[in-house]
């Protein structure tokens, strides 16, 4: 799901799943602005006041981060330049499941996209030979 058009930029997300107790990634991409210091990335979660994560002017701004995500989130700062706004989520909890919004603002405009994040005790199938 994405928004595009005048004053809007295209943002793309991918539904993904996280293994409880492990680290997970919420995927989000956009057409990168060469003016890196003008890029703002915000991650929000439905039903949660405050932000999951905010990245602006080339660094994290966690001043509005909700306490349930404290110390557990990171963006791939070195990959923002190539349009990667994905969020790294450490120590995935059952309560992390839900609808997330990846919001992007650049010098050209803004856009957002939602993704459903599922959590559970997923395991790789064993193959018996």
């Amino acid at each position: 799901f994405g928004i595009s058009g005048k004053h809007f930029i295209t943002v793309t997300t991918f539904t993904s799943a996280g293994n409880i107790g492990e680290d997970g990634t919420l995927s989000c991409t956009f057409e990168p602005d060469i003016k890196l210091n003008g890029i703002v990335i915000q991650w929000l979660k439905e039903g949660i006041k405050g932000l999951v994560h905010e990245f602006k002017e080339g660094k994290d701004d966690l001043s509005q981060q909700h306490e349930m995500f404290r110390g557990r989130t990171a963006v791939f700062a070195d990959q923002v330049v190539v349009g990667n706004a994905s969020l790294r989520l450490k120590n995935v909890q059952l309560t992390d499941a839900g609808t997330y919004t990846c919001y992007i603002r650049t010098s050209k405009g803004k856009g957002n996209a939602n993704l459903e994040y599922k959590t559970g005790a997923f395991s790789m199938p064993e193959i018996n030979v």
């Epitope: 057409e31 060469i34 890196l36 070195d78 190539v82």
Partner: antibody
Framework: EVQLLESGGGLVQPGGSLRLSCAAS????????MHWVRQAPGKGLEWVAS????????YYADSVKGRFTISRDNSKNTLYLQMNSLRAEDTAVYYC?????????WGQGTTVTVSS | DIQMTQSPSSLSASVGDRVTITCRAS??????LNWYQQKPGKAPKLLIY???SLQSGVPSRFSGSGSGTDFTLTISSLQPEDFATYYC?????????FGQGTKVEIK
């Protein structure tokens, strides 16, 4: 093999025009932003212009703004630099470079000489 | 515009020497700094991106450090093929800007 190949350079009189091309191969051109960088004889590197993967973002150095136009044709895997109102100080080797975490792939360069 | 200042402008060193080149930005660029190597008549080559990440295929004797305004490129043991000119470049803001270059010559 990932490759960039510039062409279109040459000798031109002040006030004249040239169009440089940069042909890309070996990678998905439409997924990458691109840059033009130049180097005057015996001098350092100077950024000229940049264009994002879908042409949504375009930026120019002040020294070429209003005279140069960067563009791309993703169907032809080609980057362009249209240079108008050329000046003696535009004399340089012009490189195209792929925009990744750094300018990670460069062409061999094409020489532009502006002289009467 | 963000100015990038490299020092020294040139240096003489011997094979096996540890070489350090510094780059200073006129304002904070976080970690958005690249290092390039250029040999005469050739296109530049990316060595380090994001201040300290080694580009694929680049020997591990090259390393980068720093953030904010002060950055360093280090060659731990200079090899004959390392004699070249080195440039830093910021990509935090447009216009993208390069340092003036540091020429590493044979002593």
């Amino acid at each position: 093999e990932v490759q960039l190949l510039e062409s279109g350079g040459g000798l031109v009189q002040p006030g004249g025009s040239l169009r440089l091309s940069c042909a890309a191969s070996g990678f998905t051109f439409s997924s990458y932003g691109m840059h033009w960088v130049r180097q005057a004889p015996g001098k350092g590197l100077e950024w000229v212009a940049s264009i994002s993967s879908s042409s949504g973002y375009i930026y120019y150095a002040d020294s070429v703004k209003g005279r140069f136009t960067i563009s791309r044709d993703n169907s032809k895997n080609t980057l362009y630099l249209q240079m108008n109102s050329l000046r003696a100080e535009d004399t340089a080797v012009y490189y195209c470079a792929r925009a990744s975490s750094g300018m990670d792939v460069w062409g061999q360069g094409t020489t532009v000489t502006v002289s009467s | 515009d963000i100015q990038m200042t490299q020092s020294p402008s040139s240096l003489s060193a011997s094979v096996g020497d540890r070489v350090t080149i510094t780059c200073r930005a006129s304002q904070s660029i976080r970690s958005y700094l690249n290092w390039y190597q250029q040999k005469p008549g050739k296109a530049p080559k990316l060595l380090i991106y994001y201040a300290s990440s080694l580009q694929s295929g680049v020997p591990s004797r090259f390393s980068g450090s720093g953030s904010g305004t002060d950055f360093t490129l280090t060659i731990s043991s200079l090899q004959p093929e390392d004699f070249a000119t080195y440039y830093c470049q910021q990509y935090y803001s447009t216009p993208l800007t390069f340092g003036q270059g540091t020429k590493v010559e044979i002593k």
